[in-house]
């Protein structure tokens, strides 16, 4: 504690100019005062002035009024500072002395003589109001007032509460009369060191370092930090929780980067071909006859479909083709024969059957041969039966497809799941994507294959309520609560049917 006992001397009357011993002062009583302040005593005794003492210079002769003076020698009121808790009681001894010596430092002069003394004992509360008193004896009268006030930055009824107004990192406050803190606008807390964030700033997702601010924690955005940020890799998606990637309409894939309506948006298929929103690139072109290529952009030779039968040779012309027929055949495609079974037209052991009363014939071919005259060895690969880039190989009476890595099946039509070899560690969930498997990791793990144990597991603190399951999702710093039936909220903290602001008590 810290305070000041103040004594204001107002008037001293010693009309006859007498000393306490009955002698008179020559030429008059040149008066100064000694003040001794000590702890309360029922009977005032000599001894140290435990609360302080002070002397004045000569203030006047015999009778005089003491004027207020704020500085220098002869200051009035007199100041008796203390640095302890004010006890509320005191003893005060005021002595009037005559000095024949120095006006300014009479205390040091020899031959000083006592004029009179008064003793006051009692209680005194801290306060600004002066207590006024007057003491008389046979020869003298003293008028005075006194009070106890607290030093700067000290407050309370015993000046024991320290409070210094501040506006810095450690607090933002002024001091009340009782010494309690009064926070400056925008600040709160015991020491007024907590800023009051922007009204509506989300309690969990936002924070502030100064008033009316709302700074979002990772994964959140917006004025009130109540809107999530999608995943870093997300292209055409949004989120309902941080780092999610929920695809906009028409987009698919883990990062919503696969155009589900590629055909409509980009029209990649040329020359009247049909576009389907499927396949490894997000679309497939089905070409009209006479065209080939990924986008049906390449025109085929008119002879590419082998239109000439019976061994006829094909010649390309500007917008069509021409068949040169071998001996015994005629027609646009060499489809008519001048031969009969008598000419033994069937090769490779084919059987000849007469038609149209012997004017024409038909050959029945043995296995592995074909053509009007059984002249062609069957090539089972001509129909391109192998899908997904598989290689077709003739094996005697049959053919096989040699599949590229990642495909299987008779026609290489089946995609081998990358997930079949269980690449995800620690119970991660595997998703097959075009560029390989992607693992969604359980709480506590991350990495491409869930191989990294997360030291700061967001789920470790058990943030989900009401029996919800916690997942770390796509980012190890954030968690997702999977709510049981009947509960909603980012932490499953609200029962269904109650507004999110309703303080639910289980």
């Amino acid at each position: 504690g810290s305070g000041i006992f103040q004594l204001r001397l107002q008037e001293f009357v010693n009309q006859r100019g007498m000393l306490a011993n009955g002698q008179s002062c020559e030429p008059g009583c040149r008066t100064f005062f000694r003040i001794c302040l000590k702890h309360f005593q029922a009977t005032f005794s000599e001894g140290p002035c435990t609360f302080g003492n002070v002397s004045t210079p000569v203030l006047g002769t015999n009778s005089f009024v003491v004027r207020d003076k704020n500085s220098g020698s002869g200051r009035n009121p007199l100041q008796l500072p203390f640095n302890f808790t004010w006890p509320g009681t005191f003893s005060l001894n005021i002595q009037a002395w005559h000095t024949p010596g120095d006006d300014l430092r009479p205390e040091t002069s020899p031959g000083n003589s006592l004029i009179s003394q008064i003793i006051i004992q009692g209680s005194l509360a801290v306060g600004k109001i002066w207590r006024t008193d007057e003491q008389n004896d046979t020869l003298t009268r003293l008028s005075y007032s006194y009070r106890v006030i607290c030093s700067d930055n000290y407050y309370g009824e015993s000046c024991s509460r320290l409070c210094k107004k501040r506006d810095d990192h450690f607090g933002h406050y002024e001091c009340q009369p009782d010494g309690s803190l009064s926070c400056l606008p925008g600040w709160t807390g015991k020491y007024c060191d907590q800023p009051i964030c922007l009204s509506g700033c989300h309690e969990q997702n936002g924070y502030c370092s100064k008033p009316d601010e709302c700074i979002c924690r990772p994964g959140w955005q917006g004025r009130l930090c109540n809107e999530c940020i999608p995943h870093n890799g997300c292209r055409h998606g949004t989120c309902s929780i941080p780092w999610q990637c929920a695809c906009d309409e028409g987009w698919g894939g883990l990062f919503c980067d696969q155009d589900l309506n590629y055909c409509t948006h980009h029209s990649p298929c040329k020359n009247g071909s049909t576009c389907s929103n499927s396949g490894p690139k997000g679309y497939t072109c089905t070409c009209l006859p006479g065209y080939t290529g990924e986008h049906c952009e390449l025109g085929l030779s008119k002879c590419a479909s082998n239109p000439c039968r019976n061994g006829g040779s094909c010649k390309d012309q500007e917008n069509s083709y021409h068949c040169l027929c071998p001996p015994g055949y005629y027609g646009q495609h060499c489809e008519h024969s001048t031969l009969t079974c008598a000419d033994s037209p069937c090769f490779n052991g084919g059987s000849c059957r007469e038609r149209n009363q012997g004017s024409s014939y038909a050959c029945e071919c043995p296995p592995n041969f074909t053509g009007s005259n059984c002249e062609k060895k069957v090539d089972r690969c001509t129909s391109n039966p192998c899908a997904n880039g598989g290689q077709c190989q003739n094996r005697g009476p049959s053919r096989t497809c040699r599949c590229r890595p990642g495909f299987t099946g008779t026609h290489c039509e089946l995609h081998i799941s990358d997930c079949a070899r269980s690449p995800c560690a620690h119970g991660g969930t595997c998703h097959d994507l075009e560029n390989g498997p992607v693992c969604t990791c359980p709480a506590g793990f991350s990495g491409r294959r869930c191989e990294v144990r997360i030291t700061h597991d967001a789920c470790a603190s058990g943030p989900c309520f009401n029996g919800a399951t916690c997942y770390t999702g796509l980012s190890p710093n954030n968690f997702v609560c999977n709510c049981p039936y009947g509960f909603v909220g980012s932490r499953c903290e609200f029962p269904v049917g109650l507004p999110p602001s309703f303080p639910w008590v289980a």
């Epitope: 370092s209 700074i215 979002c216 924690r217 990772p218 994964g219 959140w220 955005q221 917006g222 004025r223 809107e227 940020i229 999608p230 870093n232 890799g233 997300c234 292209r235 055409h236 998606g237 949004t238 906009d248 991350s446 990495g447 990294v452 997360i454 700061h456 980012s475 190890p476 710093n477």
Partner: antibody
Framework: EVQLVESGGGLVQPGGSLRLSCAAS????????MAWVRQAPGKGLEWVAT????????YYRDSVKGRFTISRDNAKNSLYLQMNSLRAEDTAVYYC???????????WGQGTLVTVSS | DIQMTQSPSSLSASVGDRVTITCRAS??????LAWYQQKPGKAPKLLIY???NLADGVPSRFSGSGSGTDFTLTISSLQPEDFATYYC?????????FGQGTKLEIK
């Protein structure tokens, strides 16, 4: 493919103004917060400003507050940085980036050079 | 503001070497740390986010580790295209701040 293309850089006198633009493609621009990051010649990277996707809330580094304004036009898939009262210390390559102040900057433009000199 | 300090500021290495760059934060930033690669005259490119997650299309020779205040970027077997400047960045506290960079040069 995500693309961010900045424009509008150039030489300007101290106290002058410039407006940088960033054209975005390859992603749904309106779904994502955006930022400007700068790099003084031969120096490191320094975040400048951010704008949210949801409500257009803006944040600035202290040294540019009151002088720079970040804005966006979702209909045009464009981000802007209006720079007023330019100082010599604002000289830098300014990059447009996808991200907020509390998320990584996942995609960056090629940058546009702003030189403030008399 | 949080200070990010990278070390070393530069280092020389050979193709095939294993290289480690460290980044220290002046206070706890949990796992909210990213690493970027920048080649001369080019824009930075995100390599790693959330301390240890590889960004899309980044080779698996890059990896990140750490938490709290100390973080590491490791390149397991240096390739010719990896010679560049690398920056770390924290996004846990406002404002976001970057390290001063580490220049990786060919020996």
């Amino acid at each position: 493919e995500v693309q961010l293309v900045e424009s509008g850089g150039g030489l300007v006198q101290p106290g002058g103004s410039l407006r940088l633009s960033c054209a975005a493609s390859g992603f749904t621009f309106s779904n994502f917060p955006m930022a400007w990051v700068r790099q003084a010649p031969g120096k490191g990277l320094e975040w400048v400003a951010t704008i949210s996707s949801s409500d257009g809330t803006t944040y600035y580094r202290d040294s540019v507050k009151g002088r720079f304004t970040i804005s966006r036009d979702n209909a045009k898939n464009s981000l802007y940085l209006q720079m007023n009262s330019l100082r010599a210390e604002d000289t830098a390559v300014y990059y447009c980036a996808r991200g907020y102040y509390n998320s990584p900057f996942a995609y960056w433009g090629q940058g546009t050079l702003v030189t403030v000199s008399s | 503001d949080i200070q990010m300090t990278q070390s070393p500021s530069s280092l020389s290495a050979s193709v095939g070497d294993r290289v480690t760059i460290t980044c220290r934060a002046s206070e706890d930033i949990y796992s909210n740390l990213a690493w970027y690669q920048q080649k001369p005259g080019k824009a930075p490119k995100l390599l790693i986010y959330d301390t240890n997650n590889l960004a899309d299309g980044v080779p698996s020779r890059f990896s990140g580790s750490g938490s709290g205040t100390d973080f590491t970027l490791t390149i397991s077997s240096l390739q010719p295209e990896d010679f560049a400047t690398y920056y770390c960045q924290q996004y846990n506290n406002y404002p976001p701040t970057f390290g001063q960079g580490t220049k990786l040069e060919i020996k």
